[in-house]
Interface confidence: low
């Protein structure tokens, strides 16, 4: 066949015209409503996109494809029926009206139509396969999307939970930081106060050092004068001795005076010396001498002063050895010496009286009816019994007694080093209610001092006293 044209008639039927030689054949076929027109050619791969489709679009497109398939199927069935009907009619007409040799042409046309039908069916099968393929793909994509959405939701929940935890942690840490800041402010204030105190101490010590330097210069000058005086006195003494030996040989009735020694101020008092002052004391069976101040007036007299503080002129931050043998000036501030006191108080029973003065003109005392110190091997541990007096109902020297501690011998009960922190040698506990060998603070600088001269049960923890005296006397005096 040479030509095969298609056109539309007025009642919506498709007109197929076939030209063969001098004859032309026209077929009128019905057109399906939803069939794709030739003006919008079908693209076979249009649905095979790799990019994910929106779910609603995919469903719509699937419905359209299903409708097209259904319509095509109906159209094919109608076409077959139409062809069969027309075939019968045309065959009759051909047999009646046409020449016998046109039969071949008719068969050719019919064959052509059948081929077209077969081609259309094959195309529809392709489309159906493509639709199924696309449907499967869409289902897989939907499943993947669903899984991905679940995974994302879980991740979001986990992250939200993590954010909440971090927020809680942040608020906790903020609170902690604020608390620490408060703490640090207080600590800094405390450190500043201590620094101020230390600066005052340093300036005070500087002035003391200057004074001492002046005294040393004066003492050096005085020393040379004294040496000359001593030399002169020695000559005088030698002359006197010569004279005495001469007179003794002439007068044998003059007895040689015995050398008398005293173990304590009680013995000095009993020997008739009833004036306050510095006396030389010697322990029995010993040649070692110590100079001590004897109070011959207070409470009947006979008191051996073992410690005195009155003006801050002597540094009490001393070593173990210095506290052992004693230091200072017996007429002023001094420490008699732990070794002497230990030996003395272990030979007989002694009482201890502690006399205190504050900066307001008040005085108080604590009296212990039995006092002794252990030996050096036991760190000069203090032993006290029977407290009376006006400086507190409770003993400000911790009971039971503690070992003696100094800046170089830490024998206290504190993880700290009380002697280094509070200054001075003392029978520290941890660190305890007293320290009469602490820093000497002048008036108006004597409060809120943790390292001052302290007797807690009289004046409290931060009060530094004006004056202290520790004195001992035999219990049977």
């Amino acid at each position: 066949y040479n030509n095969f044209r298609k056109s539309m008639d007025s009642i919506g039927k498709k007109q197929y015209q076939v030209q063969h030689g001098s004859c032309s054949y026209t077929f009128l076929l019905p057109e399906m409503d939803n069939c794709r027109s030739s003006s919008s050619p079908y693209v076979s791969n249009a649905v095979q996109r790799d990019a994910p489709l929106e779910y609603d679009d995919s469903v719509q497109r699937l419905q359209v494809l299903e409708n097209i398939m259904e319509n095509n199927t109906q159209w094919l069935m109608k076409l077959e029926n139409y062809i069969q009907d027309n075939m019968k009619k045309e065959m009759v007409e051909i047999q009646q009206n046409a020449v016998q040799n046109q039969t071949a042409v008719m068969i050719e046309v019919v064959t052509n139509l059948l081929n077209q039908t077969a081609e259309q069916t094959r195309k529809l099968t392709d489309v159906e396969a493509q639709v199924l393929n696309q449907t499967t793909r869409l289902e897989l994509q939907l499943l993947e999307h669903s899984l991905s959405t679940n995974k994302l939701e879980k991740q979001i929940l986990d992250q939200t939970s993590e954010i909440n935890k971090l927020q809680d942690k942040n608020s906790f840490l903020e609170k902690k930081v604020l608390a620490m800041e408060d703490k640090h402010i207080i600590q800094l204030q405390s450190i500043k106060e201590e620094k101020d105190q230390l600066q005052v101490l340093v300036s005070k010590q500087n002035s003391i050092i200057e004074e001492l330097e002046k005294k040393i210069v004066t003492a050096t000058v005085n020393n040379s004068v004294l040496q000359k005086q001593q030399h002169d006195l020695m000559e005088t003494v030698n002359n006197l001795l010569t004279m005495m030996s001469t007179s003794n040989s002439k007068d044998p009735t003059v007895a040689k005076e015995e050398q008398i020694s005293f173990r304590d101020c009680a013995e000095v008092f009993k020997s008739g010396h009833t004036t306050n002052g510095v006396y030389t004391l010697t322990l029995p069976n010993s040649t070692e001498e110590v100079k001590a101040y004897c109070d011959m007036e207070a409470g009947g007299g006979g008191w051996t002063i073992i410690q005195r503080r009155e003006d801050g002129s002597v540094d009490f931050q001393r070593t173990w050895k210095e506290y052992k043998v004693g230091f200072g000036n017996p007429s002023g501030e001094y420490w008699l010496g732990n070794e002497f006191v230990s030996q003395l108080t272990n030979q007989q029973r002694y009482v201890l009286k502690i006399h205190l003065k504050d900066w307001e003109g008040n005085e108080a005392y604590s009296l212990y009816e039995h006092f002794y110190l252990s030996s050096e091997e036991l760190n000069y541990r203090i032993h006290l019994k029977g407290l009376t007096g006006t400086a507190g109902k409770i003993s400000s020297i911790s009971q039971p007694g503690n070992d003696f501690s100094t800046k170089d011998a830490d024998n206290d009960k504190c993880i700290c080093k009380c002697s280094q922190m509070l200054t001075g040698g003392w029978w520290f506990d941890a660190c305890g209610p007293s320290n009469l060998n602490g820093m000497y603070y002048p008036q108006r600088q004597n409060t809120n001092k943790f390292n001052g001269i302290k007797w807690y049960y009289w004046k409290g923890s931060g009060y530094s006293l004006k004056g202290t005296t520790m004195m001992i006397r035999p219990a049977d005096f």
């Epitope: 809120n448 807690y456 923890s461 931060g462």
Partner: nanobody, 126 residues
Amino acid sequence: EVQLVESGGGLVQPGGSLRLSCAASGFALDYYAIGWFRQVPGKEREGVSCISSSDGITYYVDSVKGRFTISRDNAKNTVYLQMNSLKPEDTAVYYCATDSGGYIDYDCMGLGYDYWGQGTQVTVSS
């Protein structure tokens, strides 16, 4: 504002137990000696127990030794007094106080104590 707040008091039968708490606010307790004191109307205030700041050394008045335990939790800024085997003579208002001047004192007389709580009543009665 510096404050000490006692809690945990109440009515208890002889032989019973109570735990008193002293919570500090406005300052850190770490560097303070802390004391528990009690007072019966018409009598002098008595130091019951104290604890030092630096090393936790404790002091107890003879009448409570072996029965009462003082402890401190610096992290919570709180001091506790665990009272066991309570006796009728333990009935009193219990106060806590801090000593900032003494630093390491464990003395328990109440002299020089800067801050005091408002007190909590402890009554031991059958």
